[in-house]
Interface confidence: low
């Protein structure tokens, strides 16, 4: 009740707790290494509160420091498959605007079939994050195996 | 400025920063793949502020979006052991109430002896999280190698 | 109760959203397994808001529960290299003050070339975190491959 009262003066949203958790929609056509994401409760447990999707890529709507996290699992994969198809690499970066293009987080699969990591990074309104999976193996679309998200942490 | 004003009506606790970090207590009996957790300052650096343990499983007490994270290291393990005992898989999911049962996060060990990941997910009061380790290898109980936690992020 | 009262006078910063994200500066001399970190906007996307660096190690300035995260990638590494040089292990712990010395998080590389994990842990003002990399392989200094950070979560 006290919480609701305070909300009348200051909606929680103004604290800037932007957050998103996405599930894999599809991979790009050949020559496009990007993973295309989707989100929304109708799809399962994914959501966007603040950030938005722009053609399957995540666009930031509030300046701040964000925790970016990702897990990608390769489909139909064993350690033998993974090593035979090495290098398979996942990179998360700012791909737009071009002036701010930079790789934020990069991992190779080596003999594993899953990578998972997270990091803190400053992001600005309008930054679009792309996730590039290079190599011949395809990612699993299972929502508990492959996901990508951001969480606003502070201004 | 507006934030400071709102704080006059709203103490931090009501924001609901529920958080828990657990250490492994024991594995289940045969046919029960669940890991059983424990937490509390007397045990070391584990704690529960909001969520509770119910027979070694973590029960959520506040609706919201949570960051769920886990690391599990297999005991007496080398990459040879891990590959020989493949598949060894760790899954985190809502196991109760049954109507909300779903796998949230899943990883296989392949040739590694540690898995670690994290994700954002909506959880509701009463949700119980279970961590299922399937396979014949046992997890390490070292508190810096195996741990499981949640952090409330926003409503 | 005292916290709620203090909030009435204190701006957002007083909530203690201390946060830091560091990039690798250099490894230590022989017999010193510690990684030495650096941070600041001039270096790229690393930063310190609250915590400080003390001779390349991260010192905490505010009591609370923190999310600690790390990713370390080995340089010039393949799964063959990693397994040949096993064990290569990364440990994050409180190394000072000596009375609070403890390992918080530990991972081995086995046949992989990257480790990444995160955990919640209570830290106190004055705690210094050290990251020890044991083994003969060297870490990559690429800022998207090796990084270390903390985020204050709650009192």
């Amino acid at each position: 009740q006290r919480f609701a009262q305070a909300q009348q003066q200051l909606p929680l949203e103004s604290l800037g707790w932007d957050v998103a958790e996405l599930q894999l929609n599809h991979t790009g056509p050949q020559q496009d290494p990007r993973l295309y994401w989707q989100g929304g409760p109708a799809l399962g447990r994914s959501f966007l509160h603040g950030p938005e999707l722009d053609k399957g890529q995540l666009r930031i709507h509030r300046d701040g420091i964000y925790m970016v996290h990702i897990q990608v699992t390769l489909a139909i994969c064993s350690s033998t498959t993974a090593s035979r198809h090495h290098p398979t690499t996942l990179a998360v970066g700012i791909c737009s605007p071009a002036s701010r293009s930079i790789s934020l987080l990069r991992l190779s699969f080596h003999q594993g079939c899953t990578i998972a990591s997270q990091r803190l990074t400053p992001l600005a309104r309008g930054d679009t994050l792309c996730t590039n999976l290079t190599g011949t193996l395809l990612p699993s679309r299972n929502t508990d195996e492959t996901f990508f998200g951001v969480q606003w942490v502070r201004p | 400025q507006r934030f400071a004003q709102a704080q006059q009506q709203l103490p931090l606790e009501s924001l609901g920063w529920d958080v828990a970090e657990l250490q492994l207590n024991h594995t289940g009996p045969q046919q029960d793949p669940r890991l059983y957790w424990q937490g509390g300052p007397a045990l070391g650096r584990s704690f529960l502020h909001g969520p509770e343990l119910d027979k070694g499983q973590l029960r959520i007490h506040r609706d919201g979006i949570y960051m769920v994270h886990i690391q599990v290291t297999l005991a007496i393990c080398s990459s040879t052991t891990a590959s020989r005992h493949h598949p060894t898989t760790l899954a985190v999911g809502i196991c109760s109430p049954a109507s909300r049962s779903i796998s949230l996060l899943r990883l296989s060990f392949h040739q590694g002896c540690t898995i670690a990941s994290q994700r954002l997910t909506p959880l509701a009061r009463g949700d119980t999280l279970c961590t299922n380790l399937t396979g014949t290898l046992l997890p390490s109980r070292n508190t810096d190698e195996t741990f499981f936690g949640v952090q409330w992020v926003r409503p | 109760q005292r916290f709620a009262q203090a909030q009435q006078q204190l701006p957002l910063e007083s909530l203690g959203w201390d946060v830091a994200e560091l990039q690798l500066n250099h490894t230590g001399p022989q017999q010193d397994p510690r990684l030495y970190w650096q941070g600041g906007p001039a270096l790229g996307r690393s930063f310190l808001h609250g915590p400080e660096l003390d001779k390349g190690q991260l010192r905490i300035h505010r009591d609370g529960i923190y999310m600690v995260h790390i990713q370390v990638t080995l340089a010039i590494c393949s799964s063959t290299t990693a397994s040949r040089h096993h064990p290569t292990t990364l440990a994050v712990g409180i190394c000072s003050p000596a009375s609070r010395s403890i390992s918080l998080l530990r991972l081995s590389f086995h046949q992989g070339c990257t480790i990444a994990s995160q955990r919640l842990t209570p830290l106190a003002r004055g705690d210094t975190l050290c990251t020890n990399l044991t083994g003969t392989l060297l870490p990559s200094r690429n800022t998207d491959e090796t990084f270390f950070g903390v985020q204050w979560v709650r009192p």
Epitope: D18, A42, L43, H49, K55, H61 | - | -
Partner: antibody, heavy 123, light 107 residues
Framework: QLQLQESGPGLVKPSETLSLTCTVS??????????WNWIRQPPGKGLEWIGR???????YYNPSLKSRVTISVDTSKNQFSLKLSSVTATDTAVYYC???????????????WGQGTMVTVSS | EIVMTQSPATLSVSPGERATLSCRAS??????LAWYQQKPAQAPRLLIY???TRATGIPARFSGSGSGTEFTLTISSLQSEDFAVYYC?????????FGGGTKVEIK
């Protein structure tokens, strides 16, 4: 109870700018839980989505209208507005404002609509 | 843009009978489809979202099904208040688009 109310001139001359306002009552326009949309319906025809604005002022427009559309928000008045420039007779339609809920239920669907306002473009 | 095609354009049904309305998308929508009802001189009303979930307060006689590119709205037993125009809408991609509508009239 949330209500949306469109207002603005019912008649606009060709080549001029159509301006409409939607007043939101019963909810804060600053909530991240919602998007605020404009949709139109020419007489006897189907519905066409024009565009939307979020609490932060970020907008998405229908590409077919993008060059002529501006949607803005006035949080102090709990209103959002539509401006459509260089109008022609084909812009004659009933214009609706609608809320899109994007938080746990009915994602990206229009759950609350205004009653609509008829705008005729004629000299 | 995703083109939504509804059929038939007009459906003549007697009260108490079942009505089946179709909506086809030019590309897969997963389940990101909604149905609306519009009566003369009124704003549309949300009936179904997520292809099959009834919105709050919508009677059980309305049901949605389908996924991908083919979707169906079924009204199991038409009541007098159900005679209206029905629109499908996709929210899988930009721009958000509606179908041309199906008019359900009294036979």
């Amino acid at each position: 109870q949330l209500q949306l109310q469109e207002s603005g001139p019912g008649l606009v001359k060709p080549s001029e700018t159509l301006s409409l306002t939607c007043t939101v009552s019963g909810a804060s326009i600053t909530s991240t839980s919602y998007y605020w949309n404009w949709i139109r319906q020419p007489p006897g025809k189907g519905l066409e989505w024009i565009g939307r604005i979020s609490y932060s002022g970020s907008t998405y427009y229908n590409p077919s209208l993008k060059s002529r559309v501006t949607i803005s928000v006035d949080t102090s008045k709990n209103q959002f507005s539509l401006k459509l420039s260089s109008v022609t007779a084909t812009d004659t339609a009933v214009y609706y404002c609608a809320r899109q809920i994007r938080y746990n239920w009915n994602p990206d669907t229009f759950d609350i609509w205004g009653q609509g306002t008829m705008v005729t473009v004629s000299s | 843009e995703i083109v939504m095609t509804q059929s038939p354009a007009t459906l003549s049904v007697s009260p108490g009978e079942r009505a089946t309305l179709s909506c086809r998308a030019s590309q897969s929508l997963n389940s990101n489809l909604a149905w609306y009802q519009q009566k003369p001189a009124q704003a549309p009303r949300l009936l179904i979202y997520g292809a099959s979930t009834r919105a709050t307060g919508i009677p059980a006689r309305f049901s949605g099904s389908g996924s991908g590119t083919e979707f169906t709205l079924t009204i199991s037993s038409l009541q007098s208040e159900d005679f209206a125009v029905y629109y499908c809408q996709q929210y899988d991609n930009w721009p958000l688009t509606f179908g041309g509508g199906t008019k359900v009239e009294i036979k």
